[in-house]
């Protein structure tokens, strides 16, 4: 029950996070005009990853796309790439995690397959969240650098007569949306990875009788692995998750006095 809840919550948190990453990527307000030195401006500038906008005194907003690819700063291209990679990984992660959900039955899918899918989606969510956080942080760093650079030469004289205020940009709403969304996706991914541990099927213990061919002995090997004779269904050595989170429907995996003859 706890595994299902952890997995479900991880999925929902990641879903919200990825929706936020998509929203942040599409938003125009990655950087907004700093009004500290010019609070009376009738023309308000703000920029996104894909276009820059100007809100004029009439309330009309004019946006112009960046119709060049080569002319854009490398950092902006890098941020775009990070955000897109984050979205793509997140979307694939969501798709995988839907099939991995314990509450959804798809044919005769084994718990081991679901566990693997949960782990895969969890890792994808973690990487997706990290990509978004990295992208937003790179952009924020770029803004801080430019802010102080433009502050250094804030006023440029027009022939020594007229002072013109250089436009400075500060953090826009999209940065905060991106940070929060990236964090949520990361948390969701971690929750999926935790849920995966609980989903992993453990060694089935035969407490009453151990079937084996005559003349072969079954020995218990310490160190968390059980030796197998090669007969019966247990053909692989499986790791026992000692001390892991357990639910009431899981069988205890410690050796008992009936485990070997």
């Amino acid at each position: 029950m706890a595994v299902t809840a952890c997995q479900g919550l991880g999925f929902v948190v990641s879903l919200i996070g990825i929706a936020g990453i998509i929203a942040a990527t599409c938003m125009d307000q990655w950087s907004t005009q700093d009004l500290y030195n010019n609070p009376v401006t009738a023309v308000f500038n703000y920029q996104g990853l894909w276009r820059s906008c100007v809100r004029e005194s009439s309330g009309f907003t004019e946006c112009r796309g960046y119709f060049t690819l080569l002319g854009l700063p490398a950092m902006l291209q890098a941020v775009r790439a990070l955000m897109i990679v984050g979205i793509v990984l997140g979307a694939i992660g969501l798709l995988v995690s839907i099939f991995a959900l314990k509450c959804i039955r798809i044919g005769s899918m084994e718990d081991s397959a679901k566990a693997n899918m949960t782990l895969t989606s969890g890792i994808m969510f973690i990487v997706s969240g990290l990509c978004a956080i990295a992208g937003v942080s790179v952009f924020a760093n770029m803004l801080v650098t430019n802010f102080w650079m433009s502050t250094a030469n804030m006023y440029t004289g027009m022939g020594g007569m007229v002072q013109t205020v250089q436009t400075r940009y500060t953090f826009g709403a999209a940065l905060f949306v991106g940070w929060v969304a990236g964090g949520l996706t990361l948390i969701g991914g971690v929750m999926m990875c935790i849920a995966c541990r609980g989903l992993a099927p453990e060694e089935t213990n035969y407490k009453a009788v151990s079937y084996h061919a005559s003349g072969h002995s079954v020995a218990y090997k310490p160190g968390g692995f059980k030796a197998s004779t090669g007969f019966g269904s247990n053909t692989k050595n499986k790791k026992i998750y000692d001390g892991g989170a357990r639910t009431e429907d899981e069988v205890q995996s410690y050796p008992s006095k009936h485990d070997y003859v």
């Epitope: 005009q33 010019n38 009376v40 401006t41 009738a42 023309v43 500038n45 820059s52 100007v54 004029e56 005194s57 009439s58 309330g59 009309f60 004019e62 112009r64 027009m158 007229v162 002072q163 013109t164 250089q166 436009t167």
Partner: antibody, heavy 115, light 113 residues
């Protein structure tokens, strides 16, 4: 057809208040601010302030703060300007203007303050 | 507040003549965000509200004859009428559209000889 229709002329006593209207039609009312401009007889234009019909947000020229109050009624696509404590200085024409670059203006409302 | 200074205050011309009027602002009206100058030119005829001729210093509004041309950048702007017609007799105002409060010039009155 885009139109800004202003209310008729007003004859007021000194110290009284007046509320004039500006009905917008033919465009998306909430997409553009409504600006108000004063034009004294034979003189230049003075910007009073604007109201954003979308959220009722306002911005005033410091000179007119306390004198003018801008309001809006989205349902009737009408903007209002209330002028208080009228004096002879307020006797003039008031215009409302909207759309991009204030491309459309009302016909003006003449306010006359006389004892 | 940005102060808009227009010159001359009045102009007496003959039909067909080329006319130039200037407008100076106390601060630059150039927006670095889109490299546009936020200055508007208006024409006002007696008993009528002002009419926008030129926006953003040089963009002619639709329906405005091409004899009207706006130019300039930063703090110095010019309105040129290449060949004055009788219907052009009016007062011309320039307006700062860049900073609040929005401010207007005192106007240039165009009269016929």
């Amino acid at each position: 057809e885009i139109q800004l229709q202003q209310s008729g002329p007003e004859l007021m006593k000194p110290g009284a208040s007046v509320k004039m209207s500006c009905k917008a039609s033919g465009y998306s009312f909430t997409s553009y601010y409504i600006h108000w401009v004063k034009q004294s007889h034979g003189k230049s234009l003075e910007w009073i302030g604007y109201i954003d019909p979308f959220n009722g947000g306002t911005r005033y020229n410091q000179k007119f703060e306390g004198k003018a109050t801008l309001t809006v009624d989205k349902s009737s696509t009408t903007a209002y300007m209330h002028l208080s404590s009228l004096t002879s200085e307020d006797s003039t024409v008031y215009y409302c203007a909207s759309l991009r670059f204030l491309a459309y203006w009302g016909q003006g409302t003449l306010v006359t303050v006389s004892a | 507040d940005i102060v808009m200074t227009q010159s001359p205050s009045s102009l007496t011309v003959t039909a067909g003549e080329k006319v130039t009027m200037t407008c100076k602002s106390s601060q630059s009206l150039l927006n670095s965000g889109n490299q546009k100058n936020y200055l508007t030119w208006y024409q006002q005829k007696p008993g009528q509200p002002p009419k926008v001729l030129i926006s953003r210093a040089s963009t002619r509004q639709s329906g405005v004859p091409d004899r009207f041309t706006g130019s300039g950048s930063g703090t110095d702007f010019t309105l040129t009428i290449s060949s004055v017609q009788a219907e052009d007799l009016a007062v011309y105002y320039c307006q700062n559209d860049y900073s609040y409060p929005l401010t207007f010039g005192a106007g240039t009155k165009l009269e016929l000889k």
